[in-house]
Amino acid sequence: LPRWRQQWSGSGTTSRFPETVLARCVKYTEVHPEMRHVDCQSVWDAFKGAFISKYPCNITEEDYQPLVKLGTQTVPCNKTLLWSRIKDLAHQFTQVQRDMFTLEDMLLGYLADDLTWCGEFNTFEINYQSCPDWRKDCSNNPVSVFWKTVSRRFAETACGVVHVMLNGSRSKIFDKNSTFGSVEVHNLQPEKVQALEAWVIHGGREDSRDLCQDPTIKELESIISKRNIRFFCKNIYRPDKFLQCVKNPEDSSCLSGI
């Protein structure tokens, strides 16, 4: 007889989750010499240990300690790139500008990017049918706790000038309820972070407005300034040209504004 299984509102664990995590780990350690010492089987065991056999609405930061330990990796000052609602462009940027890093360019973020996972209380099975939804079921689910944990740590260890890429096409360019707005902003350390520089990415080709004057950007500036961190903002009117100029900064067309 099939065992009764809790039905959650969210989609289930990503298919081939164990194989995906293991393969990503191997690929990452091959490409990043400073992480070659990492034992990917141990990484998978630690990842699995964070949620297997546990009630998926009762996951804590503590559950991820073994994984966080194995994924320890530092980012040089001035090289942190945060993003909100514009992940693809942020990742395209760091693929070109190899000395800057989003969370997903670090081992921990790379392993989990775009994946869903959860287990069930008292069984060693992974739940591929459904996982808790943050809004409809519970916030202390394996995926949400993971991202909240690593996002907070990523922000609190950033130093120098920190950059953030924001989506200028959205009604709330800065959204207080996003991971950036609710977690990362509040964990930047004034003793270490001299400034936050926001890059507002324009969507429309003919959009010449100064989105740095948007009320939500002013709200971000206020939050940051109150934390004794300087704030700067730049409009990126042509994201395609912006990326092209990162690739080829000597191009004559890159000497004018982007």
Epitope: K69, T74, R153, T157
Partner: antibody
Framework: EVQLLESGGGLVQPGGSLRLSCAAS????????MTWVRQAPGKGLEWVAV????????DYADSVKGRFTISRDNSKNTLYLQMNSLRAEDTAVYYC???????????????WGQGTLVTVSS | QSVLTQPPSASGTPGQRVTISCSGS????????VNWYQQLPGTAPKLLIY???NRPSGVPDRFSGSKSGTSASLAISGLRSEDEADYYC????????????FGGGTKLTVLG
């Protein structure tokens, strides 16, 4: 409440042995690396040994290597330090501490026990 | 002889700002983060600052940490009598086996 409670200290003769215990409560013990740190009377802190969350990795200060053994029993939420061939210079208060990892920076010792005094003297 | 060097003592009067330094090398502070611990008389050490400058919850913002190159420092502003304690810096040394290293400690005296 997160707590660490050391026991097993006492007076021992040079060349003797002693086993210290550290009972953990208020947190999921098997998720954390654990460490021992000692402090000789009137002196500073000296790191002694560390053990990984699952007991598979151990590391020791040169001053105790080959004489001290760190171990843990996750089913009992207890950390141990077996001390053999004790010397007068091992006289100290021994603290156990929890090791906390942050992911993007080095770890810290975020929770400490109250310590247990080991006196090595004839 | 400690791997990390701290002044043995420091002092200040209530309300003053006091700084305690911790000097190391490229193999420890230069390439690893620094933690600071406070040890009140007759008690166990307590984590005061982690990852160079971060305060655990419950630690007053009068305490701040910073790092530059191979040196770190702990600043205490608005000094209070209850801050009288020993302060230790701690880091990791990639050139040593058993890489965890402490400074020798600084005894802070609050005068008056």
């Amino acid at each position: 409440e997160v707590q660490l409670l050391e026991s097993g200290g006492g007076l021992v003769q040079p060349g003797g042995s002693l086993r210290l215990s550290c009972a953990a409560s208020g947190f999921t013990f098997n998720n954390y690396d654990m460490t021992w740190v000692r402090q000789a009377p009137g002196k500073g802190l000296e790191w002694v040994a560390v053990i990984s969350y699952d007991g598979s990795d151990k590391d020791y200060a040169d001053s105790v290597k080959g004489r001290f053994t760190i171990s843990r029993d996750n089913s009992k939420n207890t950390l141990y330090l077996q001390m053999n061939s004790l010397r007068a210079e091992d006289t100290a208060v021994y603290y156990c501490a929890r090791v906390y990892y942050y992911g993007f920076s080095g770890p810290s010792m975020d929770v400490w026990g109250q310590g247990t005094l080991v006196t090595v003297s004839s | 002889q400690s791997v990390l060097t701290q002044p043995p003592s420091a002092s200040g009067t209530p309300g003053q700002r006091v700084t305690i330094s911790c000097s190391g090398s490229n193999s420890n502070i230069g390439s690893n983060t620094v933690n600071w611990y406070q040890q009140l008389p007759g008690t166990a050490p307590k984590l005061l600052i982690y990852s160079d400058s971060n305060r655990p919850s419950g630690v007053p913002d009068r305490f701040s940490g910073s790092k530059s190159g191979t040196s770190a420092s702990l600043a205490i502003s608005g000094l209070r009598s209850e801050d009288e304690a020993d302060y230790y810096c701690q880091s990791y040394d990639s050139s040593l086996s058993g890489s965890r290293v402490f400074g020798g400690g600084t005894k802070l005296t609050v005068l008056g």
